[in-house]
């Protein structure tokens, strides 16, 4: 058992059927010694008496909050929530598992640009009686600080029989230094309770291999005289790091026809600017990667070609 | 480019940005198979990293290129002994057409344009044991080249800022 | 929301066997973990059986124990009750719950229930 905030307990269960449980002992916070009973959440019943309680906790129907009293008055509370492992695994049964980049990845996370800055998102389909906190640092060993906002609900999505809840978080790193080779992963922590079970999600990953641009901004085709080709162009997105000289992007174009099934040409450059046949009814879309590190590819960006 | 003079940005961005191609076509992976464990923390120690102080920033390489090009050489000539030892040249061999051959070819060639002929910079000792099983070299060796990935992004960056910028 | 429609009940001998079903519909039913409860006359309701959504791992009460077998098909979002063995003592209304707390055999960790179904053993 452990302290997970102030009166606030995590009792590590490790289950299986017919499992003897944890005792926990639990103590009353008060001078008295007295005359003092003992309570399970709103139910009445009494459970015990004295200054210490102690209980076998098998099952969530022995979590809750454990509250003691002296003569009808409450003297203190323990709530006690339950971290379940069942054949040494612990449970992840609050977030879905997002299976890319590959199995068991519950958090996932992207950064604009080299700045320190990063989002992490999850999915759960529990709706009611839950709560995140995140924590972050550079490195384990050693922290080194990271601040994270607050947990927000970003999304809400309906798949045939399935709802599900995006949650998402915004980390900033204290001391960022956009230009140096990271040396020390990032480390996120997320605590997730549901009604009295707690479990612990963590990912680990550096800047650089979590960086993914925003797509180019402000595509334009320019038609050029008596030709079937045109010029077109294209910006850094405003999200970039800066100077564009030392945080170079390359970039994927193609002109993608009415059907999809249509052959696509696919040009690599590291140019804002190429020459291209754009026929009437076809797209052109460019996106953005790192020059030189082979990190997610933007969105595409899109314009007409008429 | 030791005592101060410039070094040959263009042809130093060139190759560098080949560098880096020809490191993810060593180890393309990237994503996909997650290499760090417990302990990384101290064993990424051995490896020489462009870190915040060595200059290697917009600004610094303003102020003074001259401390960056020192660290990244001596990464350039750490990373060149890793691909020439028997970290790479033991069992399991390495195919016929590994890129892994011109990548040692190539970091050879940059550290040599950064330093010319009859000039000597301290070099950092390569840690000398090799693993004895050929599945802890092949893991070793993914290790080598996604630590390379990203020594050599951050020397691309500096030499192609140097080249738009710094260049005579 | 989710839907619990309890069936298979009925009257049978002491010593037979009966098997229930607990059919479940509404938004994301496949993560509930699932029990079922019963309440005998002027009784309170208590835990019988449950099974975590995966299907995985079950948790029986001592009073059912080696004579109840939960299972679930989550294919057809079904869970089933098989009681064999059954006594006059196992005569009560049988609830079909679902919950995200594995394992529980509180009633209130429960948060959607069937309407029930009656189970009368006879000697």
């Known amino acids: 058992i452990w302290e997970l905030k102030k009166d606030v307990y995590v009792v590590e269960l490790d289950w299986y059927p017919d499992a003897p449980g944890e005792m926990v002992v639990l103590t009353c916070d008060t001078p008295e010694e007295d005359g003092i009973t003992w309570t399970l959440d709103q139910s009445g019943e009494v459970l015990g008496s004295g200054k210490t309680l102690t209980i076998q906790v098998k099952e969530f129907g022995d979590a809750g909050q454990y509250t003691c009293h002296k003569g009808g008055e409450a003297l203190s509370h323990s709530l006690l929530l339950l971290h379940k492992k069942e054949d040494g695994i612990w449970s992840t049964d609050v977030l879905k598992d997002q299976k890319e980049p590959k199995n068991k990845t519950f958090l996932r996370c992207e950064a604009k640009n080299y700045s320190g800055r990063f989002t992490c998102w999850w999915l759960t389909t529990i709706s009611t009686d839950l709560t995140f906190s995140v924590k972050s640092s550079r490195g384990s060993s050693n922290p080194q600080g990271v601040t994270c906002g607050a947990v927000t609900l970003s999304a809400e999505r309906v798949r045939g029989d399935n709802k599900e809840y995006e949650y998402s978080v915004e980390c900033q790193e204290d001391s960022a230094c956009p230009a140096a080779e990271e040396r020390l992963p990032i480390e996120v922590m997320v605590d997730a309770i549901h009604k009295l079970k707690y479990e612990n999600y963590t990912s680990s990953f550096f800047i650089r291999d979590i960086i993914k641009p925003d797509p180019p901004k402000n595509l334009q085709l320019k038609p050029l005289k008596n030709s079937r080709q045109v010029e077109v162009s294209w910006e850094y997105p405003d999200t970039w790091s800066t100077p564009h000289s030392y945080f170079s992007l390359t970039f994927c174009i193609q002109v993608q026809g009415k059907s999809k099934r249509e052959k696509k040409d696919r040009i690599f450059t590291d140019k804002t600017s190429a020459t291209v046949i754009c026929r009437k009814n076809a797209s052109f879309s460019v996106q953005a990667q790192d020059r030189y590190y082979s990190s997610s590819w933007s969105e595409w960006a899109s314009v007409p070609c008429s | 480019v030791p005592g101060g003079s410039s070094p040959a940005w263009a042809q130093c961005q060139q190759l560098s940005q080949k560098l880096c191609t020809l490191a993810w076509s060593a180890h393309p992976l990237v994503g996909h198979m997650d290499l760090r464990e417990e302990g990384d923390e101290e064993t990424t120690n051995d490896v020489p990293h462009i870190q915040c102080g060595d200059g290697c920033d917009p600004q610094g390489l303003r102020d003074n290129s001259q401390f960056c090009l020192q660290r990244i050489r001596q990464g350039l000539i750490f990373y060149e002994k890793l691909l020439g030892s028997d970290i790479f040249t033991g069992e399991p061999s390495l195919l016929p057409d590994s890129p892994v051959g011109q990548l040692h070819a190539s970091l050879l060639g940059l550290s040599q344009l950064l330093q010319p002929e009859g000039h000597h910079w301290e070099t950092q000792q390569i840690p000398s044991p090799s693993p004895s099983q050929p599945w802890q070299r092949l893991l070793l060796r993914f290790k080598i080249l996604r630590s390379l990935q990203a020594f050599v992004a951050v020397a691309a960056r500096v030499f192609a800022h140097g080249a738009a910028t710094l260049s005579p | 929301e989710v839907q619990l429609v309890e069936s298979g009940g009925g009257v049978v001998q002491a010593g037979e066997s009966l098997r229930l079903s607990c059919a479940a519909s509404?938004?994301?039913?496949?993560?509930?973990?699932m029990g079922w409860f019963r309440q005998a006359p002027g009784m309170e309701r208590e835990f019988a059986a449950a099974?975590?959504?995966?299907?995985?791992?079950?948790y029986y009460a001592d009073s059912v124990k080696g004579r109840f077998t939960i299972s679930r098909d989550n294919a057809k979002n079904t869970v089933y009750l098989q009681m064999s063995s059954l006594k006059p003592e196992d005569t009560a209304v049988y609830y079909c719950?679902?919950?995200?707390?594995?394992?529980?055999?509180?009633?209130?960790?429960?948060?959607?229930w069937g309407q029930g179904t009656q189970v009368t053993v006879s000697s």
């Open positions: 719950a679902a919950g995200r707390l594995y394992p529980s055999s509180r009633s209130r960790d429960y948060d959607y």
């Open positions: 509404g938004y994301n039913v496949k993560d509930y973990e």
């Open positions: 099974i975590s959504w995966r299907g995985s791992s079950t």
